[in-house]
């Protein structure tokens, strides 16, 4: 009968901050030179032999002479209570089939890890532990006096135990939260009735949990190094250097190449001439609490990220072509590269791609002239495309052309005895039409009536107006814009020896916010079109004068403006343009984009005081010059009779006192007679203008007294 | 008694440094971690910063990086604090004083401090 | 400018119960625990108040202290002569990592 084979010397030693035990035992009466498949049973008790708290078993080919070692983690701080530890085996060899059976078991080993020294009463472990966010961690304390009630706190908040023995009691915090990196506080407070007998506390480093590296990806520029970037996603670091930020390792299998990075996103691997086209990285992610690692497999020809474009220049720069130039560095012979090119100007982009070896030209055509352009140009790999480069740019400005449009131009004939007094407007050319610079304008005055005689005024830019005294004959005007390079077509305008139309009426127009509706009669007869010219009524025409050119088809238009101010009053004349070039004065209109109610009220002369009437006059007052159209006027009288005077009815006043008004419907009515008086009594009035927007401002009245019937005035 | 013990007045001229001392008694000095709290005449508290005194560790309010050290000597239980390149703000009353939990690590964590030495009146002018 | 806001000034009638606040931000009094002072004109301070609501031993049960949030509060009642005094809050800051104090309030005891 076989010796069952006991295991013997069996140690236990402890490591505190894994919170392990570390069994070593041998096994006597193996055979010399045998090995053996063997089971051994573990056992581990808490506090007493008989609490055992874990059970296993732990499989292994035995060796004669050999030391056995295994480990096991607690997760109770060993501080906290002594553990027991025993071992029993069985032989588990095919070589034995016969029944087998345990051994006995070893003798119990006590482990116990003294931290709970010096005179204090209460101890919290474990020290300074290092966890992940998420883990379930037990606490514990250890109180010296059983009397004491011990109360526990995490982050100021209690937390409840389970008590071990009288003076071990357990915690165990479930799922742990990351709080702050400098650690979480965890403390317990030992007190007899209300008085404290001491505290201790513990701090608990949980990190973040470590994330895998996200976007992990490689790339070339120069078939040399290869640069690899990653998003690191959280830092792990932790307080007091308690936990350094996660480190990052790249692998590379098919040459087993390793590099410790050193930045936290980014990492430069030489590429070695040997020819190694593909690449299998592993990037490893690593703190003291755990690896994370990403793969990423590449030929490297399929990963090539070229550095930008060089010398971009512009050739044969003209008003609408020019030639871009650029140079790509040279990676590899027989290289292809895609390049794409974008132009910027006058508010557009076009793009283009064109193919190239080594150094690229395109020609850029149908471009405006005298404008500034911005070219940018960037390349890839046209054969494994994989990302652009970045642009490479330059501006150029194209050259200077003629004008091309006639500038658009009107005028103001006013008669004076003998002459016409011409004033000619033009509105600067846009941009698109200029081409360049405009330097002056050439106003070309050709008498119709002697053919022969004409007049050329030169007007510096940036004028847009001038002005002709002319005879009573035709004239013909021809104004050209001029540039560096040319001039644009002529506007011709032809002024008439008749005197223009006087009998058309100026009618009334209300305008809205939006602007003017005008709408006219066709002229009879052929025209070319109309213009309708308008400007402030109150003003010097050459201040505010504008027009606009309205089609031959065309009889209403809509004059829109943010210029248009409330309370300004506009005057619009409306031109039929005869295929002659002749203007006719077809109609006149005015209005208001929005009345206001008056501005002022006028000043009130008091004539012909007698004993029964006086009247009241304001002949001076401007209707004209009013934010509002004049509809007439209100007379407000007070006095101390019970009834209003025939004509005016009662009203009530903004301050809520009661009198009596009269209204006039006619502007140009500035009198008034008032009569029915008695002698020797007390009257106010006031007098206000009212447009469709209201009266004008509220004023004080003026006082009057009617004389005694013998008193002549 | 449980007390702190700090050292006597000191009037210094800008530039220079001054050293402060706190001896603990009646109590373990080394379970405790010690805190410097300065005060400006007619002015509140502020924190300089910690020291464990088992492992030596500190931590220093950011506005005296660089310019304060804390130290101890456990075999004489006390704990020191020097501050360099004085100026006239420095001028205050510099308390040492104890954290009233016997913390079992070697890191900081402010509970409350239950414990203050007398003061020492530092004067800086030129 | 201290990082933790008081009253400068709070008064009361023997007697009477007066409240002095403290307010904070996420970083000190809504996430860490706030402990509360007294110091006695040409004295070393003297805690009061730990962990929000607790008192040392000696500590009158007169004063008492909660917080909600990120504001803290130390209620006095049964005020007597001897509360006036300045009274200084306190928590420890995690973005500052270090321990902040409220400018004081100064009791008086009318």
């Known amino acids: 009968e076989r010796l069952p084979l006991t295991p013997v010397s069996l140690k236990v030693s402890t490591n505190s901050t894994r919170q392990s035990l570390h069994l070593q035992w041998t096994v006597h009466n193996l055979p010399y030179h045998q090995e053996l498949k063997m089971v051994f049973q573990i056992q581990i008790s808490r506090i007493e032999t008989s609490n055992v708290i874990w059970v296993g078993n732990y499989s292994t080919t035995v060796k004669w002479n050999q030391v056995l070692h295994w480990s096991w983690e607690s997760e109770l701080p060993l501080e906290c209570a002594t553990h027991f530890v025993r071992i029993k085996s069985l032989v588990d060899d095919a070589k034995f089939p016969e029944p087998n059976f345990w051994s006995n078991w070893s003798s119990w080993e006590e482990v116990s890890v003294q931290d709970s020294t010096g005179q204090d009463i209460l101890f919290v472990f474990p020290k300074d532990k290092l966890v992940e966010e998420g883990t379930n961690v037990t606490i514990c304390y250890v109180s010296r006096n059983i009397q004491n009630n011990v109360s526990c706190y995490l982050e100021g908040k209690q937390i409840h135990g389970e008590q071990l023995d009288p003076h071990v009691t357990a915690f165990n915090l479930n799922s742990v939260p990351f709080i702050r990196n400098k650690g979480t506080n965890i403390y317990c407070e030992a007190s007899q009735g209300n008085v404290s007998e001491g505290m201790k506390g513990i701090v608990l480093f949980v990190s973040k949990v470590l994330e895998e590296p996200k976007d992990f990806s490689c790339e070339t520029e120069d078939f040399k190094t290869l640069h690899c970037t990653w998003d690191p996603g959280t830092d792990t670091a932790l307080g007091w250097s308690k936990q350094p930020s996660q480190s990052y390792t790249l692998f590379e299998s098919f040459s087993g190449e390793k590099k410790l990075c050193t930045h936290k996103n980014w990492c430069n691997w030489q590429i070695t001439q040997d020819s190694q086209e593909t690449y299998n990285f592993t990037l490893i992610a690593e703190n003291y609490l755990r690896k994370r690692s990403v793969n990423i497999l590449f030929n490297l020809t399929h990963r090539v990220y070229l550095m930008n474009p060089f010398s971009v220049n512009f050739e044969n720069v003209n008003a609408t072509n020019a030639i871009m130039t650029w140079k790509v560095h040279s990676i590899r012979n027989n290289f292809t590269y895609l390049c794409q090119i974008e132009l910027h100007g006058e508010g557009k982009m076009m793009q283009y791609n064109v193919s190239i070896k080594v150094n690229g030209e395109y020609f850029l055509s149908e471009l405006e002239p005298a404008t500034e352009y911005m070219a940018r140009v960037r390349c890839a790999d046209a054969s494994h495309f994989w990302k652009w480069s970045e642009w490479s740019g330059q501006n150029f400005t194209t050259l200077e052309a003629a004008p091309s449009e006639a500038p658009d131009v009107w005028r103001i004939v006013s008669l004076e005895p003998g002459n016409h007094t011409v004033t000619l407007f033009w509105k600067p050319l846009s941009k698109l039409h200029a081409n360049g610079k405009i330097l002056f304008y050439n106003v070309v005055v050709e008498n119709l009536d002697k053919p022969s005689s004409s007049e050329l005024h030169s007007i510096p830019a940036p004028a847009n107006s001038t002005k002709l005294i002319l005879d009573r004959c035709s004239y013909q005007i021809c104004v050209i814009a001029n540039n560096s390079v040319g001039a644009s077509p002529a506007s011709v305008i032809v002024i008439s020896a008749d005197p223009e139309n006087k009998e058309v009426e100026e009618e009334r127009i209300a305008g809205t916010e939006g602007g003017f509706s005008l709408s006219w009669k066709p002229q009879p007869g052929d025209v070319i079109g109309y213009v309708v010219d308008w400007c402030d009524h109150t003003q010097d025409v050459l201040g505010d004068f504008q027009w606009k050119n309205v089609g031959p088809n065309t009889t209403s238009t809509v004059i829109s403006t943010d210029a248009f101010r409330p309370g300004v009053r506009y005057d619009f004349r409306i031109y039929g343009l005869s295929t002659k070039r002749i203007a006719c004065l077809l109609e006149k209109k005015t209005g208001y984009s929005q009345e206001l109610a008056p501005s002022d009220n006028p000043h009130v002369l008091v004539d012909t005081l007698t004993s029964h009437s006086f009247t009241l006059s304001w002949k001076d007052y401007s209707t004209e010059s009013q934010p509002g159209f004049i509809q007439g006027y209100h007379v407000y009288l007070k006095s101390k009779a019970r009834q209003c005077h025939p004509r005016f009815e009662k009203a009530v006043l903004s301050d809520g006192s009661e009198c009596c008004k009269y209204k006039i419907d006619n502007p140009e009515e500035k009198a008034l007679i008032v009569d029915n008086l008695k002698p020797e009594s007390f009257y106010e009035f006031f007098i206000t203008p009212f447009t469709s927007a209201g009266e004008g401002p509220s004023a004080t009245f003026t006082k009057v007294t009617t004389p005694d019937e013998h008193s002549s005035m | 008694q449980v007390q702190l013990v700090q050292s006597g007045a000191e009037v210094k001229k800008p530039g220079a440094s001054v050293k402060v001392s706190c001896k603990a008694s009646?109590?373990?000095?080394?379970?405790?971690?010690i805190n410097w709290v300065r005060q400006a005449t007619g002015q509140g508290l502020e924190w300089m910063g910690w020291?464990?005194?088992?492992?030596?560790?500190?931590d220093y309010a950011q506005k005296f990086q660089g310019r304060v050290t804390m130290t101890r000597d456990i075999s004489i239980s006390t704990a020191y604090i020097e501050l360099s390149s004085l100026r006239s703000e420095d001028t205050a009353v510099y308390y040492c004083?104890?954290?009233?939990?016997?913390?079992?690590?070697?890191?900081?964590?402010?509970?409350?401090?239950?414990?203050w030495g007398q003061g020492t009146t530092v004067t800086v002018s030129s | 400018q201290s990082v933790l806001t008081q009253p400068p000034s709070a008064s009361g009638t023997p007697g009477q119960r007066v409240t002095i606040s403290c307010s904070g931000s996420s970083s000190n009094v809504g996430s860490n625990t706030v402990s509360w002072y007294q110091q006695l004109p040409g004295t070393a301070p003297k805690l009061l108040i730990y962990t929000n609501n607790r008192r040392p031993s000696g500590v009158p049960d007169r004063f008492s202290g909660s917080k909600s949030g990120t504001s803290a509060s130390l209620a006095i009642s049964g005020l007597q002569s001897e509360d006036e005094a300045d009274y200084f809050c306190a928590a420890l800051d995690d973005s500052l990592n270090g321990v902040v104090f409220g400018g004081g309030t100064k009791l008086t005891v009318l």
């Open positions: 020291m464990n005194p088992n492992s030596g560790n500190t």
């Open positions: 004083a104890r954290d009233m939990v016997a913390a079992n690590t070697d890191y900081y964590f402010y509970y409350g401090m239950d414990v």
């Open positions: 009646g109590y373990t000095f080394t379970s405790y971690d």
